[in-house]
């Protein structure tokens, strides 16, 4: 239910050179009328390195139907999963089998959602019930972010398609976005 992936594309995000170690204060980012600059959210330049190609943050694309209770979207939506450790790119791809996982001795950079977007979804329900219109929150892009010991443990998980579809009537947990209803299938996709 929900995770019928038609397509699975991976895109590597190579961070641009930027300030270290945190993004600068984006004071009063003015999201102007009818202008979608950077999707309306400020860009992040999380860290600098002598060789930018050494870092990798992967965007995995999944196309699937979304569900809400017994109702299912009339059309599939394409979602992003942010994956990867933001470690040296040369060690990340296909490295699991060889056990070559890069572990930084310093700050832990993780590949997490940067910006979000909404997409309209029409849900078709069984039993002749009226269709429903909803807007789903989808990850628009991923970024490498430096995590500190102050970050919530939930942030250390890989971020799936919104990491979570909160179950009906249950409040989503901050940041982690609620119960990971399809997490097992998500992890298999990795």
């Amino acid at each position: 239910q929900g995770w019928q992936a038609f397509k699975n594309d991976a895109t590597e995000i190579i961070p641009e050179l930027g300030e270290y170690p945190e993004p600068p204060p984006e004071l009063e980012n003015n999201k102007t009328m009818n202008r979608a600059e950077n999707g309306g959210r400020p860009p992040h330049h999380p860290f600098e390195t002598k060789d930018v190609s050494e870092y990798s943050c992967r965007e995995l694309h999944f196309t699937r139907y979304v569900t809400d209770g017994q109702c299912r979207s009339a059309k599939p939506v394409t979602e992003l999963v942010c994956s990867g450790q933001c470690g040296p790119a040369r060690l990340l791809p296909n490295a699991i089998g060889r056990g070559k996982w890069w572990r930084p001795s310093g700050p832990d950079f993780r590949c997490i959602p940067d910006r979000y977007r909404a997409q309209r979804v029409q849900l078709l329900c069984p039993g002749g019930a009226a269709p429903r219109a909803r807007k789903v929150r989808l990850v628009a892009s991923c970024k490498c972010k430096r995590l500190t010991r102050f970050h919530n443990q939930s942030e250390l998980k890989d971020f799936g398609p919104e990491a979570a579809r909160p179950q009906k009537g249950r409040k989503p947990r901050p940041r982690a976005r609620g119960a990971k209803a399809n997490q097992a299938e998500l992890e298999n996709a990795y």
């Epitope: 999201k31 102007t32 009328m33 009818n34 202008r35 979608a36 999707g39 309306g40 959210r41 400020p42 809400d68 959602p113 940067d114 910006r115 979000y116 977007r117 909404a118 997409q119 309209r120 029409q122 009226a130 269709p131 429903r132 219109a133 909803r134 807007k135 789903v136 929150r137 628009a140 919104e162 979570a164 579809r165 909160p166 409040k171 989503p172 901050p174 940041r175 976005r177 609620g178």
Partner: antibody, heavy 121, light 109 residues
Framework: EVQLVQSGAEVKKPGASVKVSCKVS????????MHWVRQAPGKGLEWMGG????????IYAQKFQGRVTMTEDTSTDTAYMELSSLRSEDTAVYYC??????????????WGQGTLVTVSS | QAVVTQEPSLTVSPGGTVTLTCGSS?????????PYWFQQKPGQAPRTLIS???DKHSWTPARFSGSLLGGKAALTLSGAQPEDEAEYYC?????????FGGGTKLTVL
């Protein structure tokens, strides 16, 4: 759970500007869709503008275009609403309101406590 | 800009049923207007009762329900309680633009 805390009451003279802040906790501001709504004394709710995540832009109500500016400081998770060329009819309680996070967008789920702006000469 | 209309005031007896409606100057209200309903009591910020036509929230009493009725959005209160006396606002989306209705003052008498 999202929580919104707004700045304190303001008294302004006609023609001046006011800037109201709204501090977000529980989520990061960049995850949420922030809107601003005002309510004049004894009147109804009036939408001023907000972030449309579908178009990735801030949209202002026609009535306020050119006079209102909504900005965000993502480093402090604080949203701002600045209204210029104030007149007496701008006297109102100004609310920030945001969605609840989560997979389905549910807008206007969490509201600030309101900021009373009084415009008087 | 579209105008969203609501009944200025309605009265319901305790335990009774009442339906508040929300119309659009542009024509029929559909699910694509994502109707929202809010309750506001004096001196308080509004709180959302219904999102997206019919979606209740964890804090929404079961006696409230949202629907589309006769080309309008509707909020039905079944089994009114004294604490339901309040101002009720609807909201419609027109693309990225949002318009509130003028509000309905509901009296439980």
């Amino acid at each position: 759970e999202v929580q919104l805390v707004q700045s304190g009451a303001e008294v302004k003279k006609p023609g001046a500007s006011v800037k109201v802040s709204c501090k977000v906790s529980g989520y990061t501001l960049s995850e949420l869709s922030m809107h601003w709504v005002r309510q004049a004394p004894g009147k109804g709710l009036e939408w001023m503008g907000g972030f449309d995540p579908e178009g990735g832009e801030t949209i202002y109500a026609q009535k306020f275009q050119g006079r209102v500016t909504m900005t965000e400081d993502t480093s402090t998770d604080t949203a701002y609403m600045e209204l210029s060329s104030l007149r007496s009819e701008d006297t109102a309680v100004y609310y920030c309101a945001t969605d609840a996070g989560g997979y389905w967008y549910k807008f206007f789920q969490h509201w600030g406590q309101g900021t009373l702006v009084t415009v008087s000469s | 800009q579209a105008v969203v209309t609501q009944e200025p005031s309605l009265t319901v007896s305790p335990g009774g049923t009442v339906t508040l409606t929300c119309g659009s100057s542009t024509g029929t209200v559909t699910i694509d207007h994502y109707p929202y309903w809010f309750q506001q009591k004096p001196g308080q910020a509004p709180r959302t009762l219904i999102s997206d036509t019919d979606d209740k929230h964890s804090w929404t009493p079961a006696r409230f329900s949202g629907s589309l009725l006769g080309g309008k959005a509707a909020l039905t209160l079944s089994g009114a309680q004294p604490e339901d006396e309040a101002e009720y606002y609807c909201l419609l989306f027109y693309g990225g633009t949002v318009v509130f209705g003028g509000g309905t003052k509901l009296t439980v008498l």
